[in-house]
Amino acid sequence: DVERTTCPPEKEVHEIDESLIFYKKRELEACVDAALLAAQMDRVDAIPFTYEQLDVLKHKLDELYPQGYPESVIRHLGHLFLKMSPEDIRKWNVTSLETLKALLKVSKGHEMSAQVATLIDRVVVGRGQLDKDTVDTLTAFCPGCLCSLSPERLSSVPPSVIGAVRPQDLDTCGPRQLDVLYPKARLAFQNMSGSEYFVKIRPFLGGAPTEDVKALSQQNVSMDLATFMKLRREAVLPLTVAEVQKLLGPHVEGLKVEEQHSPVRDWILKQRQDDLDTLGLGLQGGIPNGYLILDLSVREALS
């Protein structure tokens, strides 16, 4: 922490301006009034403070606002945002998308994924739900940031907003997030025709259950292999060879390259070798002919 000293009279600060860049750390600490700093935050970003000096300014604001900064200050943080930790941000209440945009711009090119994720979380909490304007802002200023939200937060997305989400916005989403988003997407796109529906639903299919994947296999969709590889393992395992062949169409030829990778590997192990042979790809590892499969888990459940 910065050592406390008295401010020399000639160094007293009456406004935030460029002269402050010549102040030493201890002079900034002693001479800058926190309330003045907060009132003139909009000037800070235009002044080329060093990172050390920014540390002092942050310390000032932390003392003034121990419960978290007000949005009037947050909006004008500028490069001071780079000094914030997720713990700092967790104390904020942010409702303005202008504030979000300003801080997302500042964070670009810096390793701040944890801070950005926390900031977005605070915006969603502050606004009450993940509305269309928020989604539009995220997709425009922070592609991929949607996936930084927890499944709980994502559950506040109304289905009507799903159409604003682009495929690249979902690239970093995990299975739990897609589990939340998929039913909303299904609802949002339910009135579309077969091929149009598939194009729209495809980025969300990592959250689809087996019955929906089976239904798609009856619709001549020709699912590409990249999408197939992102399906839930649990959704793929019950599919028959015939269903996978219908689902993938010409893309089924790509299964050979993915033979050793999940979920293809696990799926192969559950198929009869005779059936796998019909794919004409030399896939190996299926259940040999004449073998009987006993599902012991069923017996255990009954006893």
Epitope: P250, H251, T278, G280
Partner: antibody, heavy 121, light 107 residues
């Protein structure tokens, strides 16, 4: 050694059909799909389609869909490509090609010697 | 379908020259491109796959680079036996497509 041996040159009249064969040896025929590629005189290579040799399911280039039929005879490890309603623009060398599944959907590492089909009245 | 635009369609260079051919894909194909050499009356011969992986027995003067949509094939020092037409092939999609070809001649 992998070999794809194609049938001999053909001369056909416009409106007729031609059936080109490709006999595979040196590998398990039912483990690799067979592809067909054609090349008109002085032109580039054009992918026509492929066929699953195990159960005969073909996929065609949209351009040829209405006129091409690809089949296989597993017992002789032979693939066939039949093109109907021939016109002069179908004059070309027709190749069968086997993919190597090293990455993605596979690139062609073995080719037949080519079959010249001439369509002329 | 993915279109492959190859350029130039023909080129003339001297023995020992560095020759560069480009292929542009109409959409992202990662690194799934192969390059073939075809001599008159012969079937195409695979030189390179997965953008830059040289086939066994192919001279090291042949090389490839790129990813996404823009790819380059290079002959570092042109030899008389390299006179041929060269084609790119995308296999990122099961419906394969070739570039239009580049005819390489000696000046």
């Amino acid at each position: 050694e992998v070999q794809l041996v194609q049938s001999g040159a053909e001369v056909k009249k416009p409106g007729a059909s031609v059936k080109v064969s490709c006999k595979a040896s040196g590998y398990t025929f039912t483990n690799y799909w067979m592809h067909w590629v054609r090349q008109a005189p002085g032109q580039g290579l054009e992918w026509m389609g492929n066929i699953n040799p195990s159960q005969g399911g073909p996929y065609y280039n949209e351009r040829f869909r209405s006129r091409v039929t690809m089949t296989v005879d597993k017992s002789t490890s032979t693939a066939y490509m039949e093109l109907s309603s021939l016109r002069s623009e179908d004059t070309a060398v027709y190749y069968c090609a086997r993919p190597y599944y090293g990455s993605s959907y596979g690139y062609f590492d073995y080719w037949g010697q080519g079959t010249t089909v001439t369509v002329s009245s | 379908d993915i279109q492959m635009t190859q350029s130039p369609s023909s080129l003339s260079a001297s023995v020992g020259d560095r020759v560069t051919i480009t292929c542009k894909a109409s959409q992202d194909i990662n690194k799934y491109i192969a390059w073939y050499q075809q001599k008159p009356g012969k079937a195409p011969k695979l030189l390179i796959h997965y953008t830059s992986e040289l086939q066994p027995g192919v001279p090291s003067r042949f090389s490839g680079s790129g990813s996404g949509t823009d790819f380059t094939f290079t002959i570092s020092s042109l030899q008389p036996e390299d006179i041929a037409t060269y084609y790119c092939l995308q296999y990122a999609n099961p419906l394969r497509t070739f570039g239009g070809g580049t005819k390489v001649e000696i000046k």
